[in-house]
C-alpha cells in the first residue's frame, strides 16, 4: 500500500485536557497533540477518527509520518502545517477520508521533506491550482513530493461548480512545473471523462500511473513518449472502447511498461485489426488473456486474443439513397 | 456585498420544533463555511453549528447533537437549522455567519433572530 505505515512500537495517547500549544512555540520533546496517538520511535502520530477540524498545532518535531484520516477538516489553509521550527522530518502524510473540501494555495509549504501524500476519499471541489507548488510563479522551487494519490476525490455531481474537475485537477498537477520528480501518481475512481492532453508530458518522473475505475473512452489525444520510466499503467475499469495504432507503438516503445487493461468495454469491429494484432505479440499488457468484447452484441464475451481478421468487421455504410427510413 | 438575513424566530414552548433559515447572498468564493451562533442575555455569542456550502459537511457543537440540524439548500443560497425537543436554555438571539474559515466562519454576519423558549 502506498499510504504511510509505522510499527506498532509504544504510542502515548495524550490527556484530553493537554492545551494545544501556539505553533510558533517549539512543542516539548514528548508532546503530543490532544486526540492523537504518538510514537517517538516510529517517529509517527496518528489523529485518526477524532471529527478534528483543524491541524493540530503542536505536532511533535520528531514526526516522520502523520496520519489525520477520517477527520472533518473541511478546509486546508495556507501553511496548514508550517511551524516553528518546522516539521523538518515529515515524509509521509496520509489525510483521506477527512472531508476535505477545499486545499489552497501553499497548503504544504514548509515540508522540505514531505515525499508521500495522500488526499483519497476527500471531495475536492476546491483544490488551488497552487495547492502542491506552494506558488504562483511560471517556475516553482521543486517539491520533494514522489507519491501523490489522489483517489476518489471527485466530489458529488451536482457540487462541481461547473468546473472541469478533469482540468481543475490538472492544473495542481502542472503549476510552476513543482512535480517533476513525482513517481507515483493515482486518480482512480475520480469520474474523469478525459486526460488533458499536457498532463503526462510534463510530469517525466513517473514510475505508476493508476487511472482505473475513471470513464476515460479514449488515449487518442494522450501521449505516453516521454514516460520512458513509467513501470505500470493501470487502466482497468473504464469506458475504452480501441486503443489506436499511435497509442500501442508508444506503449510498446516504453522500456519497463506493464500495461492493466481489464474490464473496459472493448468494441471488436475493423477498428480492432491493429489492437489485436498488437495483443498477440506484445509482452506489456498484463492478463492480455482476460480482455473480451463488449460489443457489437455478437461478438459479447469473445477473448480478444482468439479473434483473428475475419471476426473484425464494419457493417456497411449505407449510400443516402439506399438507407430506409 | 455579501449580506445575509435570518428568518423563522419566535416564541415557543419547551419541547417544540423550530427551523431557522438564513438567505445568503453577494458571496464570491468558491468554497466557504456557513455557520449557527447564539447569544444569550447576559452571555458571550456561542458556535451553534456550522455547513460547508459546496458538499455539505456538518459540524456541531456538543450541547445540540442529537436534537439541531443544520441543512443548505444550494439553489434557494439558503442555510437551514432545524431545532428539536427545545429547551429553554436555547433562548437566545440566532445568527448566522458565513466566512472561508471552518467550522467558526466569521468573515459577515447577519442581524439576528430571536428565540424565545417558556418552560
Known amino acids: 500500500s502506498s499510504s504511510p505505515t509505522s510499527s506498532a512500537s509504544s504510542f502515548s495517547s495524550s490527556a484530553p485536557f493537554l492545551a494545544s500549544a501556539v505553533s510558533a512555540q517549539p512543542p516539548l520533546p514528548d508532546q503530543c497533540p490532544a486526540l492523537c496517538e504518538c510514537s517517538e520511535a516510529a517517529r509517527t502520530v496518528k489523529c485518526v477518527n477524532r471529527n478534528l477540524t483543524e491541524v493540530p498545532t503542536d505536532l511533535p518535531a520528531y514526526v516522520r509520518n502523520l496520519f489525520l484520516t477520517g477527520n472533518q477538516l473541511a478546509v486546508l489553509p495556507a501553511g496548514a502545517f508550517a511551524r516553528r521550527p518546522p516539521l523538518a522530518e515529515l515524509a509521509a502524510l496520509n489525510l483521506s477520508g477527512s472531508r476535505l473540501d477545499e486545499v489552497r494555495a501553499g497548503a504544504f509549504e514548509h515540508l522540505p521533506s514531505l515525499r508521500q501524500l495522500d488526499l483519497s476519499h476527500n471531495p475536492l471541489a476546491d483544490l488551488s491550482p497552487f495547492a502542491f507548488s506552494g506558488s504562483n510563479a511560471s517556475v516553482s522551487a521543486p517539491s520533494p513530493l514522489v507519491e501523490l494519490i489522489l483517489n476518489h476525490i471527485v466530489p458529488p455531481e451536482d457540487e462541481r461548480q461547473n468546473r472541469s474537475f478533469e482540468g481543475m485537477v490538472v492544473a495542481a498537477l502542472l503549476a510552476g512545473r513543482a512535480l517533476q520528480g513525482l513517481r507515483r501518481l493515482e486518480l482512480a475512481s475520480n469520474h474523469f471523462l478525459y486526460l488533458p492532453r499536457d498532463v503526462l508530458a510534463q510530469l517525466p518522473s513517473l514510475r505508476h500511473l493508476d487511472l482505473s475505475n475513471n470513464s476515460l473512452v479514449s488515449l487518442t489525444y494522450v501521449s505516453f513518449r516521454n514516460l520512458t520510466h513509467l513501470e505500470s499503467l493501470h487502466l482497468e475499469d473504464n469506458a475504452l472502447k480501441v486503443l489506436h495504432n499511435g497509442t500501442l507503438a508508444e506503449l510498446q516503445g516504453l522500456p519497463h511498461i506493464r500495461v492493466f487493461l481489464d474490464n473496459n468495454p472493448w468494441v471488436c469491429d475493423c477498428h480492432m485489426a491493429d489492437m489485436v494484432t498488437w495483443l498477440k505479440e506484445t509482452e506489456v499488457v498484463q492478463g492480455k488473456d482476460r480482455l473480451t468484447c463488449a460489443y457489437p452484441e455478437k461478438m459479447r464475451n469473445r477473448v480478444l486474443l482468439e479473434l483473428n481478421s475475419a471476426d473484425l468487421d464494419c457493417d456497411p455504410i449505407l449510400p443516402p439513397s439506399l438507407q430506409t427510413s | 456585498q455579501v449580506q445575509l438575513q435570518e428568518s423563522g424566530g419566535g416564541l415557543m414552548q419547551a419541547g417544540d420544533s423550530l427551523r431557522l433559515s438564513c438567505v445568503v447572498s453577494?458571496?464570491?468564493?468558491?468554497?466557504?463555511?456557513m455557520a449557527w451562533f447564539r447569544q444569550a442575555p447576559g452571555k458571550e455569542r456561542e458556535f451553534v453549528a456550522a455547513i460547508r456550502w459546496t458538499v455539505d459537511t456538518t459540524y456541531y457543537a456538543d450541547f445540540v447533537k442529537g436534537r439541531f440540524t443544520i441543512s443548505r439548500d444550494y439553489a434557494k443560497k439558503t442555510m437551514y437549522l432545524q431545532m428539536n425537543n427545545l429547551k429553554p436554555e436555547d433562548a437566545a438571539v440566532y445568527y448566522c455567519?458565513?466566512?472561508?474559515?471552518?467550522?467558526?466562519?466569521?468573515?459577515?454576519w447577519g442581524q439576528g433572530t430571536l428565540v424565545t423558549v417558556k418552560p
Open positions: 455567519a458565513v466566512g472561508r474559515k471552518w467550522p467558526k466562519a466569521d468573515d459577515y
Open positions: 453577494g458571496v464570491t468564493w468558491n468554497s466557504y463555511t
